[in-house]
């Protein structure tokens, strides 16, 4: 602790100019004071002035008023500094002396004589208010006031709390009257060294080094650092955690750059044909009769759809066709028969039923056969019952679907998620693809399962050819070349006629 006991001498009266021993001063009592401050004593005793002592120069003769003086000789109030915790109690001895010698340093003069002395004992709290008092004896009167204040930068009831206002990186604060810290605007913490970030700045994803700032941690962006940054190269996708690429509807692939809804976005099928999406950038056109080609852009011969039934032969004509019917059949498509059940027209064990009073017939075919005369074996795969590229196989009276990897179910309609067992390490994001799961790794990791810590940028050497885009962190060898249309190979070095269905992994 550190403080100052201040004593203000106001007036001294010694009208008769007498000393304590009853003698008078000649020509008058040239008066100076000795002050001794010590710890509280119920009975004041001689001994060291434990809290300090001070002497004045000659302040006047006999009776006088003491003026305030801020500096130099004769300073008033008198200052008694201390470097300890103020105990709240004290003893004070004020002695008035006559000196025949030097005005400025009467202490050193021989022949000094005591005029009077007063002793004050009691309690005194630290504060700015002066306590005023007056002491009389038979010959003299002394008016004075006193107080205890803390030294600069010391605070509290006993001047024991040190506090120095500061505004640097170890604190931004001012000092309260009790010595506690009062943080400057924008700062918080026990030592006011923690900045208060921009209001709303995300607690985990943002931070600040000065007030009203919001600096985003890796993987986050936006004014309040509450928006994640998707994976580098993510085209048609979003994220809910950093470096993710969750595809928008209709898009697929590692970077959501593969069009799963090619039919809607590009309408590739011509001449009224039906378009079916079939995987990334894949589609199938189902042509109307009379058209062919990948996009049904080619017109067929009118006979291409085999319109003539019952073995009739078709002849193309300018805008139509003509059916030449075999014996026993007639009609535009040879659909009418002149045969009856008597002619045994039903093949492969079909049963004949007469119609129209025997003038025509109908065949009821056994299983696995069809046609008006049961002449055709049933192909149960014609309706394309297998989904997701499954292969249809006839098995006697039934058919089965042989599914591609990643699919199951009677019609290969169920997707098996390779990501269900969370194969990606270090927070990698899993994507189900045709050839198994692929992991999108966070910054600093690579490998098929993000198990490899990257120590260098594998793309820095420019390993991809033909304008391909290089990505790191997606494979054990640390980079992936995403080939442009017309190129394949681990580094997109081979030109081809067909687009690759998926980026080659180096």
């Amino acid at each position: 602790g550190s403080g100052i006991f201040q004593l203000r001498l106001q007036e001294f009266v010694n009208q008769r100019g007498m000393l304590a021993n009853g003698q008078s001063c000649e020509p008058g009592c040239r008066t100076f004071f000795r002050i001794c401050l010590k710890h509280f004593q119920a009975t004041f005793s001689e001994g060291p002035c434990t809290f300090g002592n001070v002497s004045t120069p000659v302040l006047g003769t006999n009776s006088f008023v003491v003026r305030d003086k801020n500096s130099g000789s004769g300073r008033n109030p008198l200052q008694l500094p201390f470097n300890f915790t103020w105990p709240g109690t004290f003893s004070l001895n004020i002695q008035a002396w006559h000196t025949p010698g030097d005005d400025l340093r009467p202490e050193t003069s021989p022949g000094n004589s005591l005029i009077s002395q007063i002793i004050i004992q009691g309690s005194l709290a630290v504060g700015k208010i002066w306590r005023t008092d007056e002491q009389n004896d038979t010959l003299t009167r002394l008016s004075y006031s006193y107080r205890v204040i803390c030294s600069d930068n010391y605070y509290g009831e006993s001047c024991s709390r040190l506090c120095k206002k500061r505004d640097d990186h170890f604190g931004h604060y001012e000092c309260q009257p009790d010595g506690s810290l009062s943080c400057l605007p924008g700062w918080t913490g026990k030592y006011c060294d923690q900045p208060i970030c921009l209001s709303g700045c995300h607690e985990q994803n943002g931070y600040c080094s000065k007030p009203d700032e919001c600096i985003c941690r890796p993987g986050w962006q936006g004014r309040l650092c509450n928006e994640c940054i998707p994976h580098n190269g993510c085209r048609h996708g979003t994220c809910s955690i950093p470096w993710q690429c969750a595809c928008d509807e209709g898009w697929g692939g590692l970077f959501c750059d593969q069009d799963l809804n090619y039919c809607t976005h590009h309408s590739p099928c011509k001449n009224g044909s039906t378009c079916s999406n079939s995987g990334p950038k894949g589609y199938t056109c189902t042509c109307l009769p009379g058209y062919t080609g990948e996009h049904c852009e080619l017109g067929l011969s009118k006979c291409a759809s085999n319109p003539c039934r019952n073995g009739g032969s078709c002849k193309d004509q300018e805008n139509s066709y003509h059916c030449l019917c075999p014996p026993g059949y007639y009609g535009q498509h040879c659909e009418h028969s002149t045969l009856t059940c008597a002619d045994s027209p039903c093949f492969n064990g079909g049963s004949c039923r007469e119609r129209n009073q025997g003038s025509s017939y109908a065949c009821e075919c056994p299983p696995n056969f069809t046609g008006s005369n049961c002449e055709k074996k049933v192909d149960r795969c014609t309706s394309n019952p297998c989904a997701n590229g499954g292969q249809c196989q006839n098995r006697g009276p039934s058919r089965t679907c042989r599914c591609r990897p990643g699919f199951t179910g009677t019609h290969c309609e169920l997707h098996i998620s390779d990501c269900a067992r969370s194969p990606c390490a270090h927070g990698g994001t899993c994507h189900d693809l045709e050839n198994g799961p692929v992991c999108t790794c966070p910054a600093g990791f690579s490998g098929r399962r993000c198990e490899v810590r990257i120590t260098h940028d594998a793309c820095a050497s420019g390993p991809c050819f033909n304008g391909a885009t290089c990505y790191t962190g997606l494979s054990p060898n640390n980079f992936v070349c995403n080939c442009p249309y017309g190129f394949v190979g681990s580094r997109c070095e081979f030109p081809v006629g067909l687009p690759p269905s998926f980026p080659w992994v180096a």
Epitope: D152, N153, L162, K164, K165, R166, D167, D168, H169, F170, G171, G189, Y191, D193, Q194, Y207, S209, K210, I215
Partner: antibody
């Protein structure tokens, strides 16, 4: 107990960049309430404060060196680093790293053992 | 720039009191720290916040700071106290060291 260890080349050519790393063990560099500083002492002379950094990357530099100094932190490795560019013979000194404590009002309670860097061709 | 001035050397007899001063403009309004450095060793903090001792520092080391002067006092000086002593304070965001005082125990 917290320990600090300086590392880096002991000899640097004039006009090149001096690079040193301080590795902190026995405590986390990411603790709040600390700054991590660099101080140097030319042979036979006094201490000179170079600059400091906290775990968030807030840096403060001695104005007399500011144009040449960069201090960075790598919390994942519990390290902080000093780069001093365009060095001259006057940059020859023992370089210390130290922990500055907010509770100690900026006093440095832990120091590295120092590493002598000589600038000479 | 802010400067802290120390006497280059102070001599003291064993058992006597050594006082080292450190002067700077309004230094009393800043927190002063003191470091002891022996030859070939790193500095050691002996006083922080003007007058506080870190654990392990002997009681004979004390400090004060007011006005323009901070003082490190070593009472009952021992031969092992022979070392260089540096005062340090912060001027805004810059650390400032005094020039150092060599204490010789005669």
């Amino acid at each position: 107990e917290v320990q600090l260890q300086e590392s880096g080349p002991g000899l640097v050519k004039p006009s090149e960049t001096l690079s040193l790393t301080c590795t902190v063990s026995g405590g986390s560099i990411s603790s709040s309430g600390y700054y991590w500083g660099w101080i140097r002492q030319p042979p036979g002379k006094g201490l000179e404060w170079i600059g400091d950094i906290n775990y968030r990357g807030s840096t403060y530099y001695n104005p007399s060196l500011k144009s040449r100094v960069t201090i960075s932190v790598d919390t994942s490795k519990n390290q902080f680093s000093l780069k001093l560019s365009s060095v001259t013979a006057a940059d020859t000194a023992v370089y210390y790293c130290a922990r500055e404590d907010v509770i100690l009002r900026g006093g440095s309670d832990y120091w590295g053992q120092g590493t002598l860097v000589t600038v000479s061709s | 720039s802010y400067e802290l001035t120390q006497p280059p050397s102070v001599s003291v007899s064993p058992g006597q009191t050594a006082s080292i001063t450190c002067s700077g403009q309004r230094l009393g309004d800043k927190y002063a720290s003191w470091y002891q450095q022996k030859p070939g060793q790193s500095p050691v903090l002996v006083i922080y916040e003007d007058s506080k001792r870190p654990s392990g520092i002997p009681e004979r080391f004390s400090g004060s700071n007011s006005g323009d002067t901070a003082t490190l006092t070593i009472s009952g000086t021992q031969p092992m106290d022979e070392a260089d002593y540096y005062c340090q304070a912060w001027d805004r965001d810059t650390g400032v060291f005094g020039y150092g005082t060599k204490v010789t125990v005669l």
